[in-house]
C-alpha cells in the first residue's frame, strides 16, 4: 500500500541502515517467538504481523498496538498500525523498524510475531475429460449438479467480470489489499492485471470451460498486476471472508487460494481457523518442484492442497521447475494447458498451466459435491475427493526418490454420482513430518478433528526405528513413531477414518517374557480391532524364531515380537465389522503387499515380525505395503520372511443408512 503522507521516510531510512534484525526470540525469558520467511528474496522486512494469544479481545489488541507505538515513540521510532485483526486471529499489522522486535515480543498478550512476506500466483480441453467419470463424454460435459448451492471465494488478481464465460457468475467484492508493482515503468494494463484471476474464475465456473458451471463466485483482490501479494494482505482477505460469513450466513463456502509463499505460521493458523468455522479451503501446492510443506498455505493441514498433472497423468513441468509434491499435497488435478477465459477480450480463451489451475479444478469439484450434499464437513469432503480420485496413475519417477512414498498418487475426479457414497467407510493415510536423526527423535501424525485414528504405523529408510504407538494428546489419539540410535529418522503414518459415533481406545501389552511373542486383543464387548502397532526400547530388534503367526479364530488380536510392546486400536461403532488379512512371503522381498477386497476399507497396516530389517508399513489407498531392506543385504531366508497384515473394515450401519436415503 502506498503511503498517502510523507511521514514514513524516517522509518524507511532506519530500515535501510539496520541489519537483518532478530532471527530468533530474545533471551529475556519471553515465550513469544519471531518468525520470518526462509526464502530471503520473499521477505518484507519493516512490516510485521503481531499475533496475540487466542482469547485476546479487540480492545486489548488495540491497546497492545498503542502500547507498542508509545514505547517505540519514546525510543525515537515512528510506527504505523496498518490493520487490527479480529474475527480469525487476534493481532495487528504494524510497519516498524526491526530494531523494535525485541520490545514487541515482550508486550502483554503477544503469542508470536511474523515478518510479512510475498505470495505469488501459481500459473505459468483434456482437463474436463480427466476429471469426468467414464460415463460422461467431455465434449458434452453436463455435470450432475453445477454447484449452484455453493459460493466460491477467489483470492487472486482483479478479474474481468464481464467476460462471457463468467458474466453474472462472479461478484467482484470491494476487497483489495495488494502491494505496489515492482519497477517504476510497470504499465498496469487491465488485461494483464486481470489475467490470472479471470482464467481461474473460468476454470471453476465458466459457462463453456468451467467445472462447476452453476457455482457463484466472489472475488477478492490480493494479488497485484504482476501476480504478487503479501501474507498480510491474504490474511486480511481471509478475515474479510469470515466477517462476511458471520454477517450473512449462506450455504457451503469454498475458498480458492491459487497462490503460494514461503512457509508462514500465521497464514497457516488463519486457514486453520477459517476451516474450523466450516469453510472449505483449496490451495495450489506451488510451482517450485519442491516439497509443498515448505510453502503456505499449501502446508496448512486443514487446507486441501492440490498438485498439477498433465493429460498423460505426468506431474506438470513448468520451465525448469514444476508442480510441488510431498506429504502436504492431498491430491493432483489437471494443471497443464488448461483452456479458460482470457482477459484479452470478453470472448477470448487462453491456455494456462500451474497448480493454480489444478486447485481451481478441485474447487469446482468441491462445489459440485457440496451442492449435492450441503451438510458435508471438510473431513468428509476431503475423504470423498480422495476416494473418487483416479489411483496410481501418476508416474512417480518424476518425483525425487525420497518423496515418492510421501506423495499421494491421486488425480481428482468427479464422483460417478454425487449421491450414494454415504455407505462407504472412508479412510486416508496421513504422513508425519520427518523426525530428524537424533537418537530420541519422534515424529507425530495427526488426524483431522472429526476423523478417528484407527491405526498407526512407522517407516524409516534406514530401517533403524523403534516402532510406533498411539497415544492421547489434547483429548485425541495421535500416532507417534520413534527413531533408533544411528537411524536417519522416522515417519509416523496415521490411518484416519470417518467413523460416526465411534468409541476407540488403545489396549497395550508390555513386552512378553515368553518366547512366543507379545499379544494383545480387544476384550471389551462390541469392540473390534482396527489396527496394530508395536514399539520397542531395544536398539535392534533381533529375529524371532519361529515367526510369530496369529492363531486361527482370534481375529481381534495383535501379535508381535516378544521384546516389543504391542498396541491394539479397538473401536466400537454401530455396525462396524473388521477382519484381518495376511500375506506372507517366505523368501526375502523388498516389498510385500496385501489389499482389502471391494466393499472393505483398509484401516490397519502392519508387519510381522517387527524385526529390524523391516523398514516399516504404510497404507496406500486400500493396500497395505510392508517394505524391507534391500534383499542383497538381508541374511538368511527365514530372517527375510515378512508378512503384511491388513485389517479391513466396513460399516453395515453406514450401508443401511445409505440404502434408506435412496
Amino acid at each position: 500500500q502506498e503511503d498517502e503522507d510523507g511521514d514514513y521516510e524516517e522509518l524507511v531510512l532506519a530500515l535501510r541502515s539496520e541489519e537483518d534484525g532478530l532471527a530468533e526470540a530474545p533471551e529475556h525469558g519471553t515465550t513469544a517467538t519471531f518468525h520470518r520467511c526462509a526464502k530471503d528474496p520473499w521477505r518484507l522486512p519493516g512490516t510485521y504481523v503481531v499475533v496475540l494469544k487466542e482469547e485476546t479481545h479487540l480492545s486489548q489488541s488495540e491497546r497492545t498496538a498503542r502500547r507498542l507505538q508509545a514505547q517505540a515513540a519514546r525510543r525515537g521510532y515512528l510506527t504505523k498500525i496498518l490493520h487490527v485483526f479480529h474475527g480469525l486471529l487476534p493481532g495487528f499489522l504494524v510497519k516498524m523498524s526491526g530494531d523494535l522486535l525485541e520490545l514487541a515480543l515482550k508486550l502483554p498478550h503477544v503469542d508470536y510475531i511474523e515478518e510479512d512476506s510475498s505470495v505469488f500466483a501459481q500459473s505459468i480441453p483434456w482437463n474436463l475429460e480427466r476429471i469426468t467419470p467414464p460415463r460422461y463424454r467431455a465434449d458434452e460435459y453436463q455435470p450432475p449438479d453445477g454447484g449452484s448451492l455453493v459460493e466460491v471465494y477467489l483470492l487472486d488478481t482483479s478479474i474481468q467480470s464481464d467476460h462471457r464465460e463468467i458474466e453474472g457468475r462472479v461478484m467482484v467484492t470491494d476487497f483489495e489489499n495488494v502491494p505496489e508493482e515492482d519497477g517504476t515503468r510497470f504499465h498496469r494494463q487491465a488485461s494483464k492485471c486481470d489475467s490470472h484471476g479471470t482464467h481461474l474464475a473460468g476454470v471453476v465456473s465458466g459457462r463453456d470451460a468451467g467445472v462447476a458451471k452453476g457455482a457463484s463466485m466472489r472475488s477478492l483482490r490480493v494479488l497485484n498486476c504482476q501476480g504478487k501479494g503479501t501474507v498480510s494482505g491474504t490474511l486480511i482477505g481471509l478475515e474479510f471472508i469470515r466477517k462476511s460469513q458471520l454477517v450473512q450466513p449462506v450455504g457451503p463456502l469454498v475458498v480458492l487460494l491459487p497462490l503460494a509463499g514461503g512457509y508462514s505460521r500465521v497464514l497457516n493458523a488463519a486457514c486453520q481457523r477459517l476451516a474450523r468455522a466450516g469453510v472449505v479451503l483449496v490451495t495450489a501446492a506451488g510451482n517450485f518442484r519442491d516439497d509443498a510443506c515448505l510453502y503456505s498455505p499449501a502446508s496448512a493441514p486443514e487446507v486441501i492442497t492440490v498438485g498439477a498433472t498433465n493429460a498423460q497423468d505426468q506431474p506438470v513441468t513448468l520451465g525448469t521447475l514444476g508442480t510441488n509434491f510431498g506429504r502436504c499435497v492431498d491430491l493432483f488435478a489437471p494443471g497443464e494447458d488448461i483452456i479458460g477465459a482470457s482477459s484479452d477480450c470478453s470472448t477470448c480463451f487462453v491456455s494456462q498451466s500451474g497448480t493454480s489451475q489444478a486447485a481451481a479444478h478441485v474447487a469446482g469439484i468441491a462445489a459440485m459435491m457440496l451442492s449435492a450434499e450441503p451438510e458435508l464437513t471438510l473431513a468428509e469432503l476431503r475423504q470423498r475427493l480422495i476416494h473418487f480420485s483416479a489411483k496410481d496413475v501418476i508416474n512417480e519417477a518424476w518425483f525425487p526418490e525420497d518423496q515418492r512414498v510421501l506423495t499421494p498418487n491421486l488425480v481428482a475426479a468427479l464422483p460417478p454420482s454425487t449421491h450414494g457414497a454415504g455407505w462407504q467407510l472412508f479412510c486416508r493415510t496421513v504422513w508425519s513430518a520427518h523426525s530428524g536423526p537424533t537418537r530420541m527423535a519422534t515424529a507425530v501424525a495427526r488426524c483431522a478433528p472429526d476423523e478417528e485414528l484407527l491405526s498407526c504405523s512407522s517407516f524409516s529408510r534406514s530401517g533403524k526405528r523403534r516402532g510406533e504407538r498411539m497415544e492421547a494428546q489434547g483429548g485425541k489419539l495421535v500416532c507417534r513413531a520413534h527413531n533408533a540410535f544411528g537411524g536417519e529418522g522416522v515417519y509416523a503414518i496415521a490411518r484416519c477414518c470417518l467413523l460416526p459415533q465411534a468409541n476407540c481406545s488403545v489396549h497395550t501389552a508390555p513386552p512378553a517374557e515368553a518366547s512366543m511373542g507379545t499379544r494383545v486383543h480387544c476384550h471389551q464387548q462390541g469392540h473390534v480391532l482396527t489396527g496394530c502397532s508395536s514399539h520397542w526400547e531395544v536398539e535392534d530388534l533381533g529375529t524371532h524364531k519361529p515367526p510369530v503367526l496369529r492363531p486361527r479364530g482370534q481375529p481381534n488380536q495383535c501379535v508381535g515380537h516378544r521384546e516389543a510392546s504391542i498396541h491394539a486400536s479397538c473401536c466400537h461403532a454401530p455396525g462396524l465389522e473388521c477382519k484381518v488379512k495376511e500375506h506372507g512371503i517366505p523368501a526375502p522381498q523388498e516389498q510385500v503387499t496385501v489389499a482389502c477386497e471391494e466393499g472393505w476399507t483398509l484401516t490397519g497396516c502392519s508387519a510381522l515380525p517387527g524385526t529390524s530389517h523391516v523398514l516399516g508399513a504404510y497404507a496406500v489407498d486400500n493396500t497395505c505395503v510392508v517394505r524391507s531392506r534391500d534383499v542383497s543385504t538381508t541374511g538368511s531366508t527365514s530372517e527375510g520372511a515378512v508378512t503384511a497384515v491388513a485389517i479391513c473394515c466396513r460399516s453395515r450401519h453406514l450401508a443401511q443408512a445409505s440404502q434408506e436415503l435412496q
Epitope: E62, A65, R66, A70, A73, T79, K106, L107, P108
Partner: antibody
Framework: EVQLQESGPGLVKPSQSLSLTCSVT?????????WSWIRRFPGNTMEWMGD???????NYNPSLKSRVSITRDTSKNQFFLQLNSVTTGDTATYYC?????WGQGTLVTVSS | DVVLTQTPVFLSVTLGDQTSISCRSS???????????LEWYLQKPGQSPQLLIY???NRFSGVPDRFIGSGSGTDFTLKISRVEPEDLGVYYC?????????FGSGTKLEIK
Amino acid sequence: EVQLQESGPGLVKPSQSLSLTCSVTGYTITSGYDWSWIRRFPGNTMEWMGDISYSGSTNYNPSLKSRVSITRDTSKNQFFLQLNSVTTGDTATYYCAKLPGWGQGTLVTVSS
Amino acid sequence: DVVLTQTPVFLSVTLGDQTSISCRSSQSLEYSDGYTYLEWYLQKPGQSPQLLIYEVSNRFSGVPDRFIGSGSGTDFTLKISRVEPEDLGVYYCFQGTHDPLTFGSGTKLEIK
C-alpha cells in the same frame, strides 16, 4: 516529522462550550497512536483530559467525563476537543499531543 | 486516580551544581509487561513540554547525559548532575501505567 497545531477561540464565556481543533501533519491519525488533549493551568498544574485512538475509540479523564468530548475528522487529519459548561476554572493553556510530542499550545481564557 | 507527589515545588540552583527532584506515586507504576511507565518532562519558558526520561531511567534521544532518572515501584528521582542555563523551566513527572494518565504538580527550577 509529526507536527501538531492547536486552533480555536482564545476567549470563551462561562457556561458556554470550548471547542478546539488539532491539525496533524506528517502522519495520518488513523495509522496509529493515541491523540491526546492536555491542559496546563495558570499555577503550572497539568491535567490529561482524554484521548482518541487511531481506531476512533475515546478515553476520558473521569473528572471531566460528563463535560468533555473528543472527536476527529479523518479526511482533514484533525481531531477536536469540546468542553461544555465552562467556568473560570477552565482557563488554561490547551495542548494537543501525540505523546511524547506536543503541539505549541493555545491559551483559552474563560471570562464574561 | 494515581496521585504523583512531586517535591520540591521550587528549586533554586547554582550553575554547575547537582540537584534532584523527587516523585512519589500513590500506587506502583509497574505494568503487567514488566515496564514502569514513569516519565520526566521539562517545559522551558515559552515552549511546550519535552520528554527527558522514559521508563524511569531511559534518556530520550538528544537528551544530555547529565539528566539521570532512577527509582522503582512508587519512588522516583530525577538528578541533574551539572545544572546549565538551558535547564531552567518546570519539570513534571508523568505516569502512563494507569488510566487516567496523571502528572506531578511540577517543580520550577530557577538559576541563582
